[in-house]
């Protein structure tokens, strides 16, 4: 469907948010926006978040999600906080126009994440 | 109110051409991506070939069965969608709708190809 | 090509009975599914896109759900004008847009 763009690796930060720019070509002018992120796991699929947005509004998500996000034009930058090392995988973005129909749909490669946790600090002894 | 108008549908000999137009109004036309579905009687739906709209560069995509026979093209002035058919099997006899994205669907035309 | 295996292939059910249809993709379509309802002699009609949207003017009886490569249309309190055959369709690039094979409802 879509074509949507997302970079291949990123790497999360030592304090497990990673964030990555999603992209996708529009076919026409859509109004009302759905953006989800997909973790895959083998064959599994699971939701991590997802926020609708009307263009040129905040894209927003539930206050209790992990994830964070600002739109512009037919990018969106996409924030994942809370990760640790058993999060590595891939992270798919799905764009969805929702509103005025026809109803688009487009799938991105997926952005391989990469979490290490940090080490813990050593005792010190003065 | 959103109207797909097939037309071109007709009895035709194997080996033999036709061209089917579809005439859309009421909505965007060139925001949409078009297809063309057919139902062979008695059938399920096939879904027979696609174009895609400009910010797509008019891309299409054909299913296997009609790949090399058949030639989907579009008239973003006019609101028309053409669907050429080539080399016209028996197989090919089926109900012909087109659809805007796939939200729209036209009343379909009946296309009949035997000797 | 992904394949789009649909079942059962007809049922017969009585006013009133929840009805689900099942719709099995050969890979993975995250959530890239559409379902269609065609009445006897008539056109398509679209009811549920993206796995689990209705479509405008669809009655709140119908619903979709599912993701990754099951999904399932329900009519939660069968009508005799639900009587018809049902699609589900792939929408996930590349094409083809695969269709299930259908399911026909009929009333008990």
């Known amino acids: 469907a879509m074509h949507v763009a997302q970079p291949a690796v990123v790497l999360a930060s030592s304090r497990g948010i990673a964030s990555f720019v999603c992209e996708y070509a529009s076919p026409g002018k859509a109004t009302e926006v759905r953006v989800t992120v997909l973790r895959q796991a083998d064959s599994q699929v699971t939701e991590v978040c997802a926020a609708t947005y009307m263009m040129g509004n905040e894209l927003t998500f539930l206050d209790d999600s992990i994830c964070t996000g600002t739109s512009s034009g037919n990018q969106v930058n996409l924030t994942i906080q809370g990760l640790r090392a058993m999060d590595t995988g891939l992270y798919i973005c799905k764009v969805e126009l929702m509103y005025p129909p026809p109803y688009y749909l487009g799938i991105g490669n997926g952005t391989q994440i990469y979490v290490i946790d940090p080490e813990p600090c050593p005792d010190s002894d003065f | 109110e959103v109207q797909l108008v097939e037309s071109g549908g007709g009895l035709v000999q194997p080996g033999r051409s036709l061209r089917l137009s579809c005439t859309a109004s009421?909505?965007?036309?060139?925001?949409?991506?078009m297809n063309w579905v057919r139902q062979a009687p008695g059938k399920g739906l096939e879904w027979v070939g696609q174009i895609r709209n400009k910010p797509y560069n008019y891309e299409t995509y054909y299913s296997d069965s009609v790949k090399g026979r058949f030639t989907i093209s579009r008239d973003d002035s006019k609101s028309i969608v053409y669907l050429q058919m080539n080399s016209l099997k028996t197989e090919d006899t089926a109900v012909y709708y087109c659809?805007?994205?796939?939200?729209?669907w036209g009343q379909g035309t009946t296309v009949t190809v035997s000797s | 090509d992904i394949q789009m295996t649909q079942s059962p292939s007809s049922l017969s059910a009585s006013v009133g009975d929840r009805v689900t249809i099942t719709c099995g993709a050969s890979?993975?379509?995250?959530?890239?599914l559409n379902w269609y309802q065609q009445k006897p002699g008539k056109s398509p009609k679209l009811l549920i896109y993206g796995a689990t949207n209705l479509a405008d003017g669809v009655p709140s009886r119908f619903s979709g759900s599912g993701s990754g490569t099951d999904f399932t249309l329900t009519i939660s309190s069968l009508q005799p004008e639900d009587v018809a055959t049902y699609y589900c369709q792939k929408i996930l690039s590349p094409p083809p847009w695969t269709f299930g094979g259908g399911t026909k409802v009929e009333i008990k």
């Open positions: 890979e993975i379509i995250y959530g890239a």
């Open positions: 009421g909505f965007t036309f060139s925001d949409n991506w």
């Open positions: 659809t805007g994205g796939m939200d729209y």
